[in-house]
């Protein structure tokens, strides 16, 4: 009696997910009869994947008929495939009997699921951070195989090189997943920013996946502020001019205080637009002099965006106004407090206590 | 386990047709031939036909083919095979059997139909 | 058509002896590099069983007694010694073509 083989020619096959997977076995000889199993993996616990004489395998065809007169092919069809169905598959010969009894078995062949990354979806900090300050994004991807992939930061098409990045699992998994944290240094110009992670991977053919971020959701631009006076008018007020400007997002809440006490709150609404995406916004304070006999101390105190109020200060000297109409001398600007552009500076009135 | 079980013994008037079942039980019903045989009382045996459930494809005994149809129920796994214009000389026990190794050959057998033809 | 003829058609053996049944085909049941012949026994009041098949190979649980031999046309049932549970009629059937069943050789206790 001729030695059967069982001949598996392919080590490996390498099908695209939802396609499906040809793994072929031919026998050598019609001897023994009997049938032939398919399963995926070897020893005990090994998983029946078809079984030509018995039982409901509704993802698995067999190439050939069956039935067709001296048969040795037994090459069987897997549709939808999913990276679950990875594995090494063995077609299995069984000599007839009650039962079966196991002949021999072919080589193996090892299925690989080519899984494209799902989108990968970009998230950045909770909360807002201060301009000049540095924030992490997070940019995940999930369900790809094979394993190898290539993820890149880019912020406004310039790749960026503080990023982490790790592939899960470590080990030989039926699928993975990508999750890579970038660091990006917030500046003021950045309200119309965007960073993109580009995922590559084998089954993308070329075309990378991208999520975006834009920094607008994670960037807080702190105002400048300015107070100034106009001229005296004509009946003795002083118009004080409070310029807010180059701040976002555009949640600001004004108010000025005429000796320390409020004379007037406001909210920033519907404001136009600059070009780098920031906002101004000028308050006018109208203070008749000649209702003061002392000087006058106005504070423009902003909040922005919920952070400790910001104040600029501005003295109104009343001795400096003569009372008789027409006359131009300018109230004396007493406000020392000039602050930075990056970050708020404590005023003179010691209302900031907190540094971003 | 392979089991094949056909049906009663009949009793037919000559000129009248008999169908006899055969239900399958313990494989693929669709992945394999069934063969009808049939054997005279202290005669030999004698093959009528076969049939693949899978796609109905029939093979005939030229002498029986414009007597015998061949024909299956895959939803209950039962083969049929009806012989019409019944004669004395068709009296005999009709076996199913069940071509394991596509070999043309029959490998399991069913307990045998007796079919009688008598006026 | 291929036609069987098995001879002889009847046979008595001691028991322990050996038993010799051929079984010749009207042309060469030779095809794809098998020998296309099947050799079935059949007892009284009992559907026929598989013994042979492709004329050299034993059927599972067949006894080690029986084998088959031949090629082309001439075709041989040996059983080396025989049991009493071996008296039956045996059959040779051919699958070259469709099949065909050689008239049967009954085998009975000298």
């Known amino acids: 009696e001729e030695e059967l083989q069982v001949i598996q020619p392919e080590k490996s096959v390498s099908v695209a997910a939802g396609d499906s997977a040809t793994l072929n076995c031919t026998v050598s000889s019609l001897i023994p009869v009997g049938p032939i199993q398919w399963f995926r993996g070897a020893g005990p616990g090994r998983e029946l994947i078809y079984n030509l004489k018995e039982g409901h395998f509704p993802r698995v065809t067999a190439v050939s008929d069956p039935t067709k007169r001296n048969n040795m092919d037994f090459s069987i069809r897997i549709s939808n495939i999913t990276p679950a169905d990875a594995g090494t598959y063995y077609c299995v010969k069984f000599r007839k009997g009650s039962p079966d009894v196991e002949l021999k078995s072919g080589a193996g062949t090892e299925l690989s699921v080519r899984a494209k990354p799902s989108a990968p979806v970009v998230s950045g900090p909770a909360v807002r951070a201060t301009a000049e300050h540095t924030v992490s994004f997070t940019c995940e991807s999930h369900g790809f195989s094979p394993r190898d992939i290539t993820l890149k930061w880019f912020k406004n098409g310039n790749e960026l090189s503080d990023v982490q990045t790790n592939v899960d699992p470590a080990g030989k998994s039926v699928s993975y997943s990508i999750r890579s944290t970038a660091r990006v240094l917030l500046t003021r110009r950045d309200v119309h920013s965007q960073v993109i992670c580009e995922v590559a991977h084998v089954t993308l053919q070329g075309d990378p996946l991208r999520g975006t971020a834009n920094l607008s959701e994670a960037i807080r631009v702190p105002p400048f502020l300015e107070v100034t006076q106009q001229s005296m008018r004509a009946d003795n007020q002083v118009n004080v001019t409070c310029q807010v400007t180059k701040f976002y997002p555009q949640r600001l809440q004004l108010t000025w205080l005429e000796n320390g006490n409020v004379s007037r709150t406001e909210m920033a609404s519907a404001l136009p637009e600059n070009k780098d995406g920031t906002y101004n916004w000028t308050s006018w304070l109208l203070v008749n002099v000649s209702a003061h006999r002392d000087d006058v101390k106005l504070t423009c105190q902003v909040e922005h965006d919920g952070q400790p109020a910001v104040n600029k200060s501005f003295s109104v000297k009343v001795s400096a106004h003569p009372k008789e109409q027409g006359s131009n001398t300018a109230a004396e600007n007493t406000g020392t407090n000039e602050r930075g552009s990056s970050d708020y500076k404590d005023d003179d009135d010691k209302h900031h206590h907190h540094h971003h | 386990q392979v089991q094949l079980v056909q049906s009663g013994a009949e009793v037919k008037k000559p000129g009248a047709s008999v169908k006899v079942s055969c239900k399958a039980s313990g494989y693929t019903f669709t992945n394999y031939w069934i063969n009808w045989v049939r054997q005279a009382p202290g005669q030999g045996l004698e093959w009528i036909a076969m049939?693949?459930?899978?796609?109905?494809?029939?093979h005939y005994n030229q002498i029986f083919k414009d007597r015998a149809t061949l024909t299956t129920d895959t939803s209950t796994s039962t083969a049929y095979m009806e012989l019409r214009s019944l004669r004395s000389d068709d009296t005999a026990v009709y076996y199913c059997a069940m071509d394991y190794g596509s070999l043309y050959a029959m490998d399991y057998w069913g307990r045998g139909t007796l079919v009688t033809v008598s006026s | 058509d291929i036609v069987l003829t098995q001879s002889p058609d009847s046979l008595a053996v001691s028991l322990g002896e050996r038993a010799t049944i051929n079984c010749r085909a009207s042309?060469?049941?030779?095809?794809?590099?098998?020998?296309?012949i099947f050799w079935y026994q059949q007892k009284p009041g009992q559907p026929p069983k598989l013994l042979i098949y492709?004329?050299?190979n034993r059927d599972s649980g067949v006894p080690d007694r029986f084998s088959g031999s031949g090629s082309g046309t001439d075709f041989t049932l040996t059983i080396s010694s025989l049991q009493a549970e071996d008296v039956a009629v045996y059959y040779c059937q051919e699958s070259r073509e469709l099949p065909t069943f050689g008239q049967g050789t009954k085998l009975e206790i000298k």
């Open positions: 042309q060469s049941v030779r095809s794809s590099g098998y020998n296309w």
């Open positions: 049939i693949d459930p899978s796609d109905s494809e029939t």
């Open positions: 492709l004329a050299s």
